[in-house]
Interface confidence: medium
Amino acid sequence: PEPPTACREKQYLINSQCCSLCQPGQKLVSDCTEFTETECLPCGESEFLDTWNRETHCHQHKYCDPNLGLRVQQKGTSETDTICTCEEGWHCTSEACESCVLHRSCSPGFGVKQIATGVSDTICEPCPVGFFSNVSSAFEKCHPWTSCETKDLVVQQAGTNKTDVVCGPQDRLRA
């Protein structure tokens, strides 16, 4: 008979035979023959394979190294890798989350537009006119200047992006 040149989904071609791939969570022990099926074995503890495969070795689960600021977000299974994230106050340096860095703080004159997560850094924005930030913070937004008028006071010193306005009593001598 004509040997196959292509096999069905979840099969692979070897020695003119279409053999079944091993399912996720299992590795290949031996290829099928004309008379026997593919032999697969489950991945061991701390190992995984996430696709239909013909791999002879399972992949090791990712290690979330605490020395790099990492911790386990989701424990790996035989079919999935471990997902790492960063400790509180830190975020991943890459999509693969192989190490962490401290969240950046927004300097005075800048406020937090988006608070950092385990995978993204703090996003800062300059305080627009009418707003200020006088601290270096990873959490604080720009605050609006104090409205002296609502307190029946007058502006004694104008605000900047780093300082609030200074209010004072109205000048009673003025006609």
Epitope: P1, S30, E34, F35, T36, E37, E39
Partner: antibody, heavy 123, light 107 residues
Framework: EVKLVESGGGLVQPGGSLSLSCAAS????????MSWVRQPPGKALEWLGF??????????EYSASVKGRFTISRDNSQSILYLQMNALRAEDSATYYC??????????????WGQGTTLTVSS | DIQMTQTTSSLSASLGDRVTISCRAS??????LNWYQQKPDGTVKLLIY???RLHSGVPSRFSGSGSGTDYSLTISNLEQEDIATYFC?????????FGGGTKLEIK
């Protein structure tokens, strides 16, 4: 009902030839691998060879003990399996069984057997 | 070739007994192990395939187990009709090979 009936056994002189037949019924003959197995008196079973099914081109495989002397063939129109035996020796004396093969997913096995036919090779 | 060894060539048991017949392969056969029953009149029947799967029509008192190189056939409640010779056969690698057989007799 699957049925296999062998015939053609008898007494043959050393060096002689004989052909055994196996008439199959109760299943689609062309779908199955078919095999011959023998058993010398008081001894174990011995696989001799098989002939593949239609999808696999009706090709054959033989055990080393009979390769070159025995030939397996099939008449698919009549559902008959044959074993042509040449250059017969005394040690070929045995009961000869034809057997049908089971499926790949659980390993090949002989799921149905004939009643056997006896060959005696003696001068 | 893979050698199949049935160390017990004959076995005596009483009706109702639990009987175990063993079979050893010369190398790992990955559970591709079949058991056959041969009656005194020469009739051969498949009992169990792939170590533990019962062939259609075979009574449930027959069971099989094993892995690697060591396998066994168990008859849980011996009946008169079970008097026969039992052969194991490996289906892992050509040439297919059989054990020498275990003849079961009544005490």
């Amino acid at each position: 009902e699957v049925k296999l009936v062998e015939s053609g056994g008898g007494l043959v002189q050393p060096g002689g030839s004989l052909s055994l037949s196996c008439a199959a019924s109760g299943f689609t003959f062309t779908d199955y691998y078919m095999s011959w197995v023998r058993q010398p008196p008081g001894k174990a079973l011995e696989w001799l060879g098989f002939i593949r099914n239609k999808p696999n081109g009706y090709t054959t495989e033989y055990s080393a003990s009979v390769k070159g002397r025995f030939t397996i063939s099939r008449d698919n129109s009549q559902s008959i399996l044959y074993l042509q035996m040449n250059a017969l020796r005394a040690e070929d004396s045995a009961t000869y069984y034809c057997a049908r093969y089971g499926g790949k997913l659980t390993g090949f096995y002989f799921d149905y057997w004939g009643q056997g036919t006896t060959l005696t090779v003696s001068s | 070739d893979i050698q199949m060894t049935q160390t017990t060539s004959s076995l005596s048991a009483s009706l109702g007994d639990r009987v175990t017949i063993s079979c050893r392969a010369s190398q790992d056969i990955r559970k591709y192990l079949n058991w056959y029953q041969q009656k005194p009149d020469g009739t051969v029947k498949l009992l169990i395939y792939y170590t533990s799967r019962l062939h259609s029509g075979v009574p449930s008192r027959f069971s099989g187990s094993g892995s690697g190189t060591d396998y066994s056939l168990t008859i849980s409640n011996l009946e008169q009709e079970d008097i026969a010779t039992y052969f194991c056969q490996q289906g892992n690698t050509l040439p297919w090979t059989f054990g020498g057989g275990t003849k079961l007799e009544i005490k």
